[in-house]
């Protein structure tokens, strides 16, 4: 990946609208050292998208990914 790095990913802000669920292949939580807690969804095109873990749609997507 062009963004492979030894630096810890954090998020400046969150997307404002849900991504299509079908575009997402995996997710991870950012480090507790980051100032903004965030879920990062990774799309099938390997784009990393910052999302607010408190949003209902984000929790639903995480549950869906965990079950698949």
């Amino acid at each position: 990946s062009p963004y492979s790095s030894d630096t810890t990913p954090c998020c400046f802000a969150y997307i404002a609208r849900p991504l299509p669920r079908a575009h997402i292949k995996e997710y991870f939580y950012t480090s507790g050292k980051c100032s903004n807690p965030a879920v990062v969804f990774v799309t099938r095109k390997n784009r990393q998208v910052c999302a607010n873990p408190e949003k209902k749609w984000v929790r639903e997507y995480i549950n869906s990914l965990e079950m698949s």
């Epitope: 802000a13 969150y14 997307i15 404002a16």
Partner: antibody, heavy 120, light 110 residues
Framework: QVQLKESGPGLVAPSQSLSITCTVS????????IHWVRQPPGKGLEWLGV???????NYNSALMSRLNISKDNSKSQVFLKMNSLQTDDTAMYYC??????????????WGQGTSVTVSS | QAVVTQESALTTSPGETVTLTCRSN?????????ANWVQEKPDHLFTGLIG???NRAPGVPARFSGSLIGDKAALTITGAQTEDEAIYFC?????????FGGGTKLTVLG
């Protein structure tokens, strides 16, 4: 493809306000921030501020009292308003796309800029 | 507000390695400053090269690399090309705002 284009008045009288529009295409304002940066003639870059997908903003503290950044997601437009202009606000003004994750380039695509001259 | 300092000008030759640096007056630059590097070519053409200290943007040649060297952020061009002649700006994040350095004018003789 990703494009950003600034449009502004060109000439502004001292003490008046400046309004610039950044129109974007090739991506959605619900997924990226937009930064505003300026460059006075023959000088370096100065970061002015950013508006994030949810509408939150961060500003350059030295200019915060004179700056306002807003947007219209449906029109893919971001607006910069600056009050009380003086001659040292003469500059090229740029908008740049801002990915949300820190491991990417934080101002990856830039507009071509719009020239603003403050003069009576 | 923080002040970010860069070399005002550097000169190199094609094929040589050159390192540009970016210093903060508030102390050591760390990974939490998410150092970015932006290239300015003539006619106000700006391109983001490096983000998050050491991450190349897609399409940026592998000869460009970012790192921390001592207490500074650094941009290294390994095997400079004549087309790399440009002005390079670093930008550092300070919790809620960005600050740009003054820029380094890189001349590639040849």
């Amino acid at each position: 493809q990703v494009q950003l284009k600034e449009s502004g008045p060109g000439l502004v009288a001292p003490s008046q306000s400046l309004s610039i529009t950044c129109t974007v295409s090739g991506f959605s304002l619900t997924g990226y921030g937009i930064h505003w940066v300026r460059q006075p003639p023959g000088k370096g870059l100065e970061w002015l501020g950013v508006i994030w997908p949810g509408g939150g903003t961060n500003y350059n503290s030295a200019l915060m009292s004179r700056l306002n950044i807003s947007k219209d997601n449906s029109k893919s437009q971001v607006f910069l308003k600056m009050n009380s202009l003086q001659t040292d606000d003469t500059a090229m003004y740029y908008c740049a796309r801002g990915p949300l994750i820190t491991t990417e380039v934080s101002m990856d695509y830039w507009g071509q800029g719009t020239s603003v001259t403050v003069s009576s | 507000q923080a002040v970010v300092t860069q070399e005002s000008a550097l000169t190199t030759s094609p094929g040589e390695t050159v390192t540009l640096t970016c210093r903060s007056n508030t102390g050591a630059v760390t990974t939490s400053n998410y150092a970015n590097w932006v290239q300015e070519k003539p006619d106000h053409l700006f391109t983001g090269l490096i983000g998050g200290t050491n991450n190349r943007a897609p399409g940026v040649p592998a000869r460009f690399s970012g790192s921390l060297i001592g207490d500074k952020a650094a941009l290294t061009i390994t095997g400079a090309q004549t087309e790399d002649e440009a002005i390079y700006f670093c930008a550092l994040w300070y919790s809620n705002h960005w600050v740009f350095g003054g820029g380094t004018k890189l001349t590639v003789l040849g």
